[in-house]
Amino acid sequence: ESGYAQNGDLEDAELDDYSFSCYSQLEVNGSQHSLTCAFEDPDVNTTNLEFEICGALVEVKCLNFRKLQEIYFIETKKFLLIGKSNICVKVGEKSLTCKKIDLTTIVKPEAPFDLSVIYREGANDFVVTFNTSHLQKKYVKVLMHDVAYRQEKDENKWTHVNLSSTKLTLLQRKLQPAAMYEIKVRSIPDHYFKGFWSEWSPSYYFRTPEINNSSGEMD
C-alpha cells in the first residue's frame, strides 16, 4: 500500500512546476562559498523535495542542500568554480527538474555597508562613502555599485549613479535645499564574474542645508 501511495505522490509531483533559481556567494565565510536555491512558485509544496548539486566539485561527485524554511542552502569549500554543475530538484532518487549552471555566472555579492555622507561646506558638496567586503576577496573583487538617492518625500523618484569606486561626490546645487534625503547602495559583479545585484545596504539619511538668503547659497 505504501508503495502505491508513493507512486501516486510522484505522479502528482510531476504535474507541479518545479522551476527554481539559484545564486552563489563566493568566499562568503572565509574560504567557504555558498549556494542558495529557491522555487519560483512560493506555493510549491516542498515536503519531501530535496536539492542536489553534481559536477564541478572538488573530491566529491555530489552534494545535498540543507533546507532552511523555503530556501535550500549549501556552504562548502568544495566548489571547483570551473565548468558547469548540474543542480536538480529530487524526490527520493528521482530528479524532477535540473539546470546546468556555472556557479561563477550566478554570483550575488554581499551588500555594501558603512554608508555615510559628509557635507563639505567649503566645496559645497556631499561626499558619499561606503565599504564592501569584496575588496579583501580573492575572486569577486571587481564590482559595479549602484548608489540610489531620493528626497524623502518623493516615494518612487530615485536617482541612480553607477560607479566602480566606493566614493561619490554629490554637488550641493543638484540637491534641494533644506530637504531630507535617503541614500542606499548595492553591488553587482563586473568583469570575470556574472550574476545579480546584492541586497541594498541599510539606508543613510542626511539633510541638506538651507539657502543663505544674502548670497543665494545654502547654509
Epitope: 565548468g83 558547469k84 555566472t105
Partner: nanobody, 118 residues
C-alpha cells in the same frame, strides 16, 4: 569541422620552457571552461590544469603547480599553457579540452607532442 587545434610542442632540454596554444572554433569558447591534459607513453591521460570561462579561476594538478601557467584570450578564442622548468617526466602528448559539463569534457583536440631531453 576541426574544433580544437593544439600547437607549440617540440623538443626542449630539461629546465627549459615551452608555450602551448590551443585554438578553438567552438562558438561558445568565451563561456566555456578549458583544460590541459597530457598522456605520457604507456600511461593514462592525466589532468594538468583548468581555467574558468573568464580566466579568473584556475586549478592545477600537484605535478605542475608552480611550474605551469594556464591562461586564455577570449578575443582570440585561444587557450595557452606556459611550461617552465621542464623535466623529463613532462614528456608526452598534450591535449586541450573544452566545456567541462558535469565532470565531462565535451570537446578534445588531437594533441601536440612535447619531448623533454635530459
Amino acid at each position: 569541422e576541426v574544433q580544437l587545434v593544439e600547437s607549440g610542442g617540440g623538443l626542449v632540454q630539461a629546465g627549459g620552457s615551452l608555450r602551448l596554444s590551443c585554438e578553438s572554433s567552438i562558438s561558445t569558447f568565451s563561456s566555456d571552461a578549458m583544460g590541459w591534459f597530457r598522456q605520457a607513453p604507456g600511461k593514462e591521460r592525466e589532468f594538468l590544469a583548468a581555467i574558468g570561462w573568464s580566466g579568473a579561476v584556475t586549478h592545477y594538478s600537484d605535478s605542475v603547480q608552480g611550474r605551469f601557467t594556464i591562461s586564455r584570450d577570449n578575443a582570440k578564442n585561444t587557450l595557452y599553457l606556459q611550461m617552465n622548468s621542464l623535466k623529463s617526466e613532462d614528456t608526452g602528448r598534450y591535449y586541450c579540452a573544452e566545456d567541462y559539463d558535469t565532470d565531462v569534457w565535451q570537446y578534445w583536440g588531437q594533441g601536440t607532442q612535447v619531448t623533454v631531453s635530459s
